[in-house]
């Protein structure tokens, strides 16, 4: 799915005025990205729970485990992202996998991802059928990661 | 930083032909998001190495250490990707810290990211001073996790 | 106009490291999207692509070369300085800096548009 | 890392002739550029991104392909063509510039 750019203009990159109303569906279809996190989402009670299991997604094997929290929002490119939430403090032992150790801590690793807002141009609001998308970094939470604990010197 | 998209047209958004050359900082301004990875690069020797750290980022104090490998592309955005690199084949003990402990393996969590490319529009080829975004989904390893190896039944 | 020129020793032994400059001028490598690479060619043989600084100093090298080469950049001097650690007579080779930096309506172009005339550097005891 | 192949590596030709040169990528890629070399000197760009000609090529040469096969085409050979060619491609991870090992076209 494209998007056309016009090159030039005061603003980078700036486009004319539209003819026509452009179908809701269009907009959502373009901006829609896959709607799956990075694992396959796990219905079962497990992967909700402070265990690391011995089958099923990356999240819930991990000693470290998360599930995935849905952020939507239909003006955003991409409209779905997941933030991940660590389903324990300390990570699980790799012997049970159900006991935590209090020598590992489940941290969320954080990113700032670029996504895009699809925002009426600056000056613009209610003239022309034109829209501005603008880039912005938003912080996602990708995974729990198991850590040693920060020594402080 | 803005685009501004003109809405309608039989492509999604389409826009008119320029009148002008855009300065080709004008574009790499827009499309370059964040240079950093979740986790500031280290430069230090032991990001490198296959042992958690009890300093430094997240990617060297977790069991299942990894570096960044830079991904750039100036006609994609965002310009800047990093892909994690694990750097043990199993986690690394929480008691030593340099240990490894084959009860667990250290594997890439990947996603499939939205990324968007510059690209003549479709037919157009020398013709209009206009481009397209083209949405595509491309995978990324976000960060090395800990796990269970899987039990298959 | 854009020019590239390379310079450094015509002669190193064994074992030695190879220091070579680009000076250019007609650009600068403080401009967004400008690059500046290092290519050789050994005697009757291909071109080899060895190493890439970017305008905001970001550096890439060839996997197979990458612990013996360091690029820095002098952009007050319009100067990019590549040294090659530990050379041996396979490194004996036409030495050619090329800037990287067009942006067209399509998009950006990673190839070299702008070449010195190289420098022939031979490594020998 | 992604290989380029070149065939052929050496190709005969007379003025006049329409000539064709290979560049097989060792996995899909995106656009390949083309470059003309001449004894003792540095190459020049002749083709940017598959298909676009560099500033001052004649038109006779010609560039396209896509995925892992693209071709260099001149389509009636002059006297100052005969020349080594290479295609090279740039992979962004690793960033890393590749070329082909060159066509030489000769004079038949």
């Known amino acids: 799915v494209s998007l056309r750019i016009q090159e030039g203009c005061s603003h980078l990159p700036s486009c004319c005025p539209s003819k026509e109303q452009e179908p809701p569906e269009e907009w959502l279809k373009w901006s829609s990205a896959s709607v799956s996190p990075p694992e396959p989402l796990s219905h079962t009670h497990h992967a909700e729970s402070c265990r690391a299991s011995k089958d099923g997604p990356l999240n819930s094997r991990a000693i470290s485990p998360w599930s995935y929290e849905l952020d939507r929002d239909l003006n955003r490119v991409p409209q779905d992202l997941y933030h991940a939430r660590c389903l324990c403090p300390h990570c699980v032992s790799l012997q049970t996998g159900s006991h935590m150790d209090p020598l590992g801590n489940s941290v969320p690793l954080y990113h700032n991802q670029t996504v895009f807002y699809r925002r009426p141009c600056h000056g613009e609001e209610g003239t022309h059928r034109r829209y501005c998308l603008e880039r912005r970094l938003y912080r996602v939470s990708l995974a729990c990661v198991c850590v040693r604990p920060r020594v402080m010197a | 930083v803005s685009l501004r998209i003109q809405e309608g047209c039989s492509h999604l958004p389409s826009c008119c032909p320029s009148k002008e050359q855009e300065p080709p900082e004008e574009w790499l301004k827009w499309s370059s998001a964040s240079v950093s990875p979740p986790e500031p690069l280290s430069h230090t020797h032991h990001a490198e190495s296959c042992r958690a750290s009890k300093d430094g980022p997240l990617n060297s104090r977790a069991i299942s250490p990894w570096s960044y490998e830079l991904d750039r592309d100036l006609n994609r955005v965002p310009q800047d990707l990093y892909h994690a690199r694990c750097l043990c084949p199993h986690c690394v003990s929480l008691q030593t810290g340099s240990h490894m402990d084959p009860l667990g393996n250290s594997v890439p969590l990947y996603h499939n990211q939205t990324v968007f490319y510059r690209r003549p529009c479709h037919g157009e080829e020398g013709t209009h001073r206009r481009y397209c975004l083209e949405r595509r989904l491309y995978r990324v390893s976000l960060a090395c996790v800990c796990v269970r190896p899987r039990v298959m039944a | 106009q854009v020019t590239l020129k390379e310079s450094g020793p015509t002669l190193v032994k064994p074992t030695q490291t190879l220091t070579l400059t680009c000076t250019f001028s007609?650009?600068?490598?403080?401009?967004?999207?400008?690059?500046l690479g290092w290519i050789r060619q050994p005697p009757g043989k291909a071109l080899e692509w060895l190493a890439h600084?970017?305008?905001?100093?970001?550096?890439h090298y060839k996997p197979a070369l990458k612990s013996r080469l360091t690029i820095t950049k002098d952009t007050s001097k319009n100067q990019v300085v590549l040294t090659m650690t530990n050379v041996d007579p396979v490194d004996t080779a036409t030495y050619y800096c090329?800037?990287?930096?067009?942006?067209?309506?399509?998009?950006?172009?990673?190839?070299?548009?702008?070449w010195g005339q190289g420098t022939l550097v031979t490594v020998s005891s | 890392e992604i290989v380029l192949t070149q065939s052929p590596a050496t190709l005969s030709a007379s003025p006049g002739e329409r000539v064709t040169i290979s560049c097989s990528a060792s996995?899909?890629?995106?656009?390949m550029y083309w470059y003309q070399q001449k004894p003792g000197q540095a190459p020049r760009p002749l083709i940017y991104?598959?298909?676009n000609l560099a500033s001052g090529v004649p038109a006779r040469f010609s560039g396209s392909g896509s995925g892992t096969d693209y071709t260099l085409t001149i389509s009636s050979m002059e006297p100052e063509d005969f020349a080594t060619y290479y295609c090279?491609?740039?992979?962004?991870?690793?960033?890393?510039?590749?070329f082909g090992q060159g066509t030489k076209l000769e004079i038949k």
């Open positions: 090329a800037r990287m930096g067009q942006l067209h309506y399509y998009g950006y172009d990673y190839a070299m548009d702008y």
């Open positions: 007609g650009f600068s490598l403080s401009t967004s999207g400008m690059g």
């Open positions: 600084i970017w305008w905001d100093d970001v550096k």
């Open positions: 996995s899909s890629v995106s656009y």
């Open positions: 991104r598959t298909s």
């Open positions: 090279q491609l740039y992979h962004s991870y690793p960033p890393t510039w590749t």
